[in-house]
């Protein structure tokens, strides 16, 4: 079976796919394709930020190419975002921190 | 129960707290806690390459601050450079595409 | 309401770099937006040059890349352009613009404009 | 590049015509179309984004439609304002690029 972290990789491209399929080019996420990924997928993060203008302003700073679309390199970029607001979250815990073996 | 995606971050950022606070700074990944990493959270990647040279090259592709050392933001470059690798196997598969609903 | 004032020499040598400062005010510089240099020679159209934005990402127009440089400073909500090695058809109005998050990435704020002649 | 070509390069009318810009674009711009106002001697001014939405302030006379690769702007009612020249821009990739201008003049 997979390890945990490989298979963390594969859910990474597999549900950037699962949206990014649905309209226009199969490649990219538009807006309404983020839109669903971050409401279904990312609920804790999204949180109650559901306006237009919060969805706009983080399509903008994903989108570092100006195409109006999020290609899975600006995807990943955006992930690692979050996965280090996560770790410094979890660096603020050291009684949660895994000890030595 | 966490979304995927979710608990795919959760991972990658456990993982490498699992193998940084083994020795050293607790929050960074020396060289053999990188290869422990490695050799046994990411053993598809890695395959056969586990000489010296090979791990001392990639060390320092991922030690962007030159400081001998593997902080969280560089593991996360990491990880994206990775999952673009399999991104890129995965779009070369068209029929392994998720279709439209 | 936001205001940006463009400040720099109005004549620059050919073969030397011309150097360009825009001053945001009326809002904060924050990253919400990309901040744009846009140029009008003389009884001309528009040509985009480039932007810098979030996390001080830079993109600049290819025809113009090899001359170009942009930076900013959050801290005086300033940015600026250098375009080095002008020859006479860089001679134009230069705008500084902010760009939108909305579709499209309008520009929707735009300052006066500064002629700048490239002349020996 | 994405090539913008604006017709007519400039028009004559009066206050209360309807005037009709027109914008083609070299390829498909996905409705990544913006009109911009500029007036002699003057900054531009931003007047409709994404086709067809309407900027901040900017009266409702103004109005945009299109798809694909052709767009317009129209004026419903001139007004003595109104009279400027008029420049479409896509938003659709970098480089950005704009239309060669239509000047408003009065008739």
């Known amino acids: 079976m997979a390890c945990p972290l490989e298979k963390a990789l594969d859910v990474m491209v597999s549900t950037f796919h699962k949206y990014s399929g649905k309209e226009g080019d199969k490649f990219k996420l538009n807006k309404s394709e983020l839109k669903e990924l971050l409401t279904r997928e990312l609920p804790s993060f999204l949180g109650k930020r559901t306006d237009e203008a919060a969805f706009q302003k983080l399509m903008s700073n994903l989108d570092s190419n100006r195409d109006n679309e999020v290609d899975f390199q600006e995807y990943c970029v955006f992930l690692s975002c979050i996965a280090m607001m996560c770790n410094e979250f979890f660096e603020g815990f050291p009684d949660k921190q895994p000890r030595k073996k | 129960m966490a979304c995927p995606l979710e608990k795919a971050l959760d991972v990658m950022v456990s993982t490498f707290h699992k193998y940084s606070g083994k020795e050293g700074d607790k929050f960074k990944l020396n060289k053999s806690e990188l290869k422990e990493l490695l050799t046994r959270e990411l053993p598809s990647f890695l395959g056969k390459r586990t000489d010296e040279a090979a791990f001392q090259k990639l060390m320092s592709n991922l030690d962007s601050n030159r400081d001998n050392e593997v902080d969280f933001q560089e593991y996360c470059v990491f990880l994206s450079c990775i999952a673009m690798m399999c991104n890129e196997f995965f779009e070369g598969f068209p029929d392994k595409q998720p279709r439209k609903k | 309401q936001v205001q940006l004032q463009e400040s720099g020499p109005g004549l620059v040598k050919p073969s030397q770099t011309l150097s360009l400062t825009c001053t945001v005010s009326g809002d904060s510089f924050t990253n919400d937006y990309y901040w744009n240099w846009i140029r009008q020679h003389p009884g001309k159209g528009l040509e985009w040059i480039g932007h810098?934005?979030?996390?001080?990402?830079?993109n600049y127009n290819p025809s113009l890349k090899n001359r170009l440089s942009m930076s900013r400073d959050t801290s005086k909500n300033q940015f600026s352009l250098k375009l080095s090695s002008v020859t006479a058809a860089d001679t134009a109005v230069y705008y500084c613009t902010r760009e939108s998050f909305y579709d499209g990435y309008p520009f929707d704020y735009w300052g006066q404009g500064t002629l700048v002649t490239v002349s020996s | 590049d994405i090539q913008m070509t604006q017709s007519p390069s400039s028009l004559s009318a009066s206050v209360g015509d309807r005037v009709t810009i027109t914008c083609r674009a070299s390829?498909?711009?996905?409705?990544?179309l913006n009109w911009y106002q500029q007036k002699p001697g003057g900054a531009l001014k931003l007047l409709l984004y994404?086709?067809?939405r309407l900027h901040s302030g900017v009266p409702s006379r103004f109005s945009g439609s299109g798809s694909g690769t052709d767009y317009t702007l129209t004026i419903s009612s001139l007004q003595p304002e109104d009279f400027a020249t008029y420049y479409c821009q896509q938003g659709n990739s970098l480089p950005r690029t704009f239309g060669g201008g239509t000047k408003v003049e009065i008739k």
């Open positions: 994404y086709t067809s």
């Open positions: 810098i934005g979030y996390g001080g990402n830079i």
């Open positions: 390829q498909d711009i996905r409705n990544y």
